[in-house]
């Protein structure tokens, strides 16, 4: 297993609809054809595999069927979008990238993106 640098933004604020997007960029030391990306959430004394995708370079990301994420890839960048977030989902979201094929296997883990989620205020009752 060889190490690889992964960069991601330090902070992202989710939209009022509970959607957060960020870019995960990895410094590929070679010409990988198969890449696996996993987003981990670390907070509240728990670690959650939020979503995971494997893709062939130049193709769309195929997320596992339980995923709350969508994404696209462009070169060594992966544009990730996480949906359905609530205030209690605020936490550090870590991007993990694995170059699966061809060998050698490379692994890179980012420093994490702190995603802040604020639940929208309920609309006040109205007579109109």
């Amino acid at each position: 297993c060889k190490a690889m640098h992964v960069a991601q933004p330090a902070v992202v604020l989710a939209s009022s609809r509970g959607i957060a997007s960020f870019v995960c960029e990895y410094a590929s030391p070679g010409k990988a054809t198969e890449v696996r990306v996993t987003v981990l959430r670390q907070a509240d004394s728990q670690v959650t595999e939020v979503c995971a995708a494997t893709y062939m370079m130049g193709n769309e990301l195929t997320f596992l069927d339980d995923s709350i994420c969508t994404g696209t890839s462009s070169g060594n960048q992966v544009n990730l979008t996480i949906q359905g977030l609530r205030a209690m989902d605020t936490g550090l979201y870590i991007c993990k990238v694995e170059l699966m094929y061809p060998p050698p296997y490379y692994l890179g883990i980012g420093n994490g993106t702190q995603i802040y989620v604020i639940d929208p205020e309920p609309c006040p009752d109205s007579d109109f």
Partner: nanobody, 126 residues
Framework: EVQLVESGGQLVQAGGSLRLSCTAT????????LGWFRQAPGKEREFVAA????????AYADSVKGRFTISRDNAKNTVYLQMNNLKPEDTAVYYC???????????????????WGQGTQVTVSS
């Protein structure tokens, strides 16, 4: 209505292993995340681990990560908790629960889960 039945709890020495099972009855079992929680005497019920509907994504409490493994067999309507390198502080009643919503979540909290089993006692002696 989904019913959850846990089994596998017993007395074990520190450093030992156990595998808990939770079998569900109900048509919607395969579409919901399932979780394990535990409650030690005099303490609040706490999250241990959770698994997504197809079993591809997992979540763990920091205190058990690397020692416990959650898995599920949808053909058998069963979720498992493999517990290795057990410690006295793992002593508790372990409960299986079904998530309130169909989709996977980025975090797991007691309030996210409804259908609860009766629990199985795990005692780790030093």
């Amino acid at each position: 209505e989904v019913q959850l039945v846990e089994s596998g709890g017993q007395l074990v020495q520190a450093g030992g292993s156990l595998r808990l099972s939770c079998t569900a009855t109900g048509h919607t079992y395969n579409t919901y995340p399932l979780g394990w929680f535990r409650q030690a005497p005099g303490k609040e019920r706490e999250f241990v681990a959770a698994i997504s509907p197809s079993g591809t994504l997992r979540a763990y409490a920091d205190s058990v990560k690397g020692r416990f493994t959650i898995s599920r067999d949808n053909a058998k309507n069963t979720v498992y908790l493999q517990m290795n390198n057990l410690k006295p502080e793992d002593t508790a009643v372990y409960y299986c629960a079904r998530h309130r919503s169909v989709g996977w979540r980025a975090s797991h909290h007691l309030s996210d889960y409804d259908n609860w089993g009766q629990g199985t006692q795990v005692t780790v002696s030093s």
